[in-house]
Interface confidence: low
């Protein structure tokens, strides 16, 4: 009891003068509390508490429930305090069967005795299961058992209370340890997609995934560089333990242009913060923008192969395509496909596959291409170069030698004399004319040139060489010249 | 329990057709990305075919596009993959797979099946 | 298409030793990188995801570093379970794995 010193204020004292006192059960409690500045009697057990305005408490017939600690308070309010057991055989344990602990920390399973002098005061698991290794408790009579760090490995977990008592084991009823998980890692957060892209008057719907281990995270909407309050819609899930899911929706029922912008799904929790966002981007009508991937004037040799490759952007998606020659749609030899597979793709690829191409196939090559919104085309001019190839080698009435070749690009003609002992032409000799005689024709295709050479200035045997070439490659044609007496007796053209 | 079941898999010739199931059990089927991941013998894992939990969007390996089809059946919590046109390179196990997803559209495969095998041969 | 390329092909150590295991892309993933372990006759297992975050229920003894095109999963002190055959795998662009690394006991 606390000793009185005069001139302070002293607490009050308890009669018996014990701090803890046994009772049987059915036995009477009666407490005196001695000052004479009494205000009241205050009674504790577990969340219960009761008050008492008489300097005496009386209780006639005690039961178990009665135990616990009782406490006297002066006007001063200075206290003092009695614990009372009351040893009832049939109830040694008072249960408050919540048991919530919080991850990392302690937490009380509330079962106090009825009797202190009981031994082997400890927690036992249910149906004789062994307590995890790791689990550390503390017993204290008056409060009950303490678990040391609860970790999240013990959440279920089932368990007495356990005391000896004559001998025999007993066990209280039965307590779950529910486990409030820590956030040791910051909320991950995922959106359904990166980017929209949408025509005014869509919907505009993003689904904000936001996975914790538990539903105390906080998560919410934000556009960037804006105050205003976003409406959002939210489900969630508890997948199994500590395996926490909440979508949270967000929509503009009928999205504007100024409506574009960042938005923001933010979520953070005790350890930290994430966050991540999505682009909207509203346009007043669909879009289709071209990009060739080569050249559109294309040199290609004769039998060879070439693609021709276009990239473009479609918005909405691309509903008709087509490759066009001559007035003749492609049925095959191209393909087109999404340049990604994303959702919000909205780049694609088309190729033609132009093969073994002949000199008569240059021309205009066009990719057509439409949406709901739009069509856009884009033109190849496509030119096939090929191999000079005399059409004609003639000894006109005039005595003119006369070469025409056809070839693109446009091929030179060359002359050249050799006289008859000679294997090799290499005198050459000047034209006296040349013409390109389809310049104004049509753009693609091959080009004709005609050379003209006077064949009165040859005095000797021999052979004379046209030679037609290009970029491509070289064709020539032979005249053979004889002379008996002083006239040219025969001219044999020959390739 | 997560799980995923396999089936379908078998002996076909070139040429030949094989439709395989997997059979979802454990967690909301409807709300999952799934796929299909292959395993020549002796070789290394190749993704196959993707199909979206929302709009069924499908994504093919490039050697298989055009021959196999992706599908599935929320109701009926399966995934199926319809290959057509069958080649002796298709010889794998073929395994289901859930994707789950982190960031915004990057996806991990987080429960797999145990395989089905497909031979094909003459 | 994203390549994606394993090193080495075989990795022969002691139970409790560390192993260092490499993975390199054609070009920057992004940090979009998972690795998956497969033991013989059972089907893959994620162990990491985003290069470094660690699926649940992995043990702590594995972890991922990384960025751009290069990626590595460690495992600190091998345990006898450990030794398997470990794919990388990219989510940047579709999807493609590497050819695998085989941990093996020494």
């Known amino acids: 009891q606390p000793s009185v010193s005069p001139g302070e204020p002293s607490p009050p004292s308890i009669h018996p003068a014990k701090s803890e006192l046994i009772v049987r059960v059915g036995n009477e409690i009666r407490l005196l509390c001695i000052d004479p500045g009494f205000v009241k009697w205050t009674f504790e057990i577990l969340d219960e508490t009761n008050e008492n305005k008489q300097n005496e408490w009386i209780t006639e017939k005690a039961e178990a429930t009665n135990t616990g600690k009782y406490t006297c308070t002066n006007k001063h309010g200075l206290s003092s305090s009695i614990y009372v057991f009351v040893r009832d055989p049939a109830k040694l344990f008072l249960v408050d069967r919540s048991l919530y602990g919080k991850e990392d920390n302690d937490t009380l399973v509330r079962c106090p005795l009825t009797d202190p002098e009981v031994t082997s005061y400890s927690l036992k698991g249910c149906q004789g299961k062994p307590l995890p290794k790791d689990l550390r408790f503390v017993p204290d009579p008056k409060a009950g058992i303490t678990i040391k760090s609860v970790k999240r490995a013990y959440h279920r977990l089932c368990l007495h209370c356990s005391a000896d008592q004559e001998g025999k084991s007993v066990l209280s009823d039965k307590f779950i340890l529910k486990v409030r998980p820590a956030f040791k890692a910051v909320p991950v957060v995922s959106v359904s997609k990166a980017s929209y892209l949408l025509r005014e008057g869509e919907e505009f719907t993003v689904t904000c995934t936001i996975k914790d281990v538990s539903s105390s995270v906080y998560s919410t909407w934000k556009r960037e560089n804006s105050q205003t309050k976003l409406q959002e819609k939210y489900n969630s899930w508890h997948h199994g333990d500590f395996n926490y899911e909440r979508q949270a929706t967000l929509t503009i029922s009928s999205a504007r242009v100024n409506d574009s912008g960042v938005f923001m799904c933010y979520a953070n929790n005790t350890f930290g913060s994430a966050n991540v966002t999505t682009t909207l981007e509203v346009v007043d009508k669909g879009f289709i923008n071209i990009f060739p991937m080569i050249n559109t004037t294309v040199f290609v040799n004769d039998g060879e192969n070439v693609d021709l490759i276009v990239e473009y952007e479609a918005f909405p998606k691309p509903e008709h395509q087509q490759w066009i020659y001559m007035n003749r749609t492609f049925t095959d030899k191209w393909e087109d496909y999404p340049k990604s597979e994303n959702e919000s793709n909205i780049r694609y690829v088309s190729e033609l596959h132009l093969t073994r191409l002949k000199g008569t196939e240059g021309g205009t090559y066009t990719f057509l291409v439409s949406n709901s919104d739009v069509n856009a085309s884009i033109a190849f001019n496509v030119y096939v170069n090929t191999k000079p190839e005399i059409l004609t080698y003639d000894r006109l009435v005039n005595g003119m030698l006369q070469c025409v070749a056809a070839g693109f690009p446009e091929p030179t003609i060359d002359w050249y004399f050799c006289p008859g002992t000679e294997q090799r032409c290499s005198a050459s000799v000047l034209p006296v004319d040349v013409q390109t005689l389809n310049a104004s024709g049509p753009p693609f295709g091959k080009l004709v040139v005609q050379s003209s050479i006077d064949s009165s200035a040859f005095k000797h045997n021999g052979t004379v060489e046209c030679k037609a070439y290009n970029d491509v490659g070289k064709t020539s044609a032979y005249f053979n010249f004889a002379f008996k007496g002083n006239n040219k007796e025969q001219i044999h053209p020959h390739t | 329990e997560v799980q995923l079941v396999e089936s379908g898999g078998g002996l076909v010739q070139p040429g030949g057709s094989l439709r395989l199931s997997c059979a979802a059990s454990?967690?909301?089927?409807?709300?999952?990305?799934m796929a299909w991941v292959r395993q020549a013998p002796g070789k290394g894992l190749e993704w196959v075919a993707n199909?979206?939990?929302?709009?069924?969007?499908?994504y093919y390996l490039d050697s298989v596009r055009g021959r196999f089809t992706i599908s599935r059946d929320n109701a009926k919590n399966s995934l199926y993959l319809q290959m057509n046109s069958l080649r002796a390179e298709d010889t794998a196990v073929y395994y289901c797979?859930?994707?789950?997803?982190?960031?915004?559209?990057?996806?991990?495969?987080?429960?797999w099946g145990q395989g089905t095998t497909v031979t094909v041969s003459s | 298409e994203i390549v994606m390329t394993q090193s080495p092909a075989t990795l022969s150590l002691s139970p409790g030793e560390r192993a260092t295991l490499s993975c390199r892309a054609s070009?920057?993933?992004?940090?979009?990188l998972n690795w998956y372990q497969q033991k013989p006759g059972q089907a893959p297992r994620l162990l990491i995801y985003?290069?470094?975050r660690l699926q649940s229920g992995i043990p702590a003894r594995f972890s991922g570093s990384g960025s751009g095109t290069d990626y590595t999963l460690t495992i600190s002190s091998l345990e006898p379970e450990d030794f398997a055959v470990y794919y990388c795998?990219?989510?940047?662009?579709?999807?493609?794995f590497g050819g695998g690394t085989k941990v093996e006991i020494k």
């Open positions: 795998q990219q989510g940047k662009k579709l999807w493609s």
């Open positions: 199909i979206n939990q929302i709009a069924g969007s499908t």
């Open positions: 797979a859930r994707g789950d997803y982190y960031g915004t559209t990057y996806w991990y495969f987080d429960v």
């Open positions: 454990g967690f909301t089927f409807s709300d999952y990305y």
């Open positions: 070009q920057d993933i992004s940090n979009y």
């Open positions: 985003y290069t470094s």
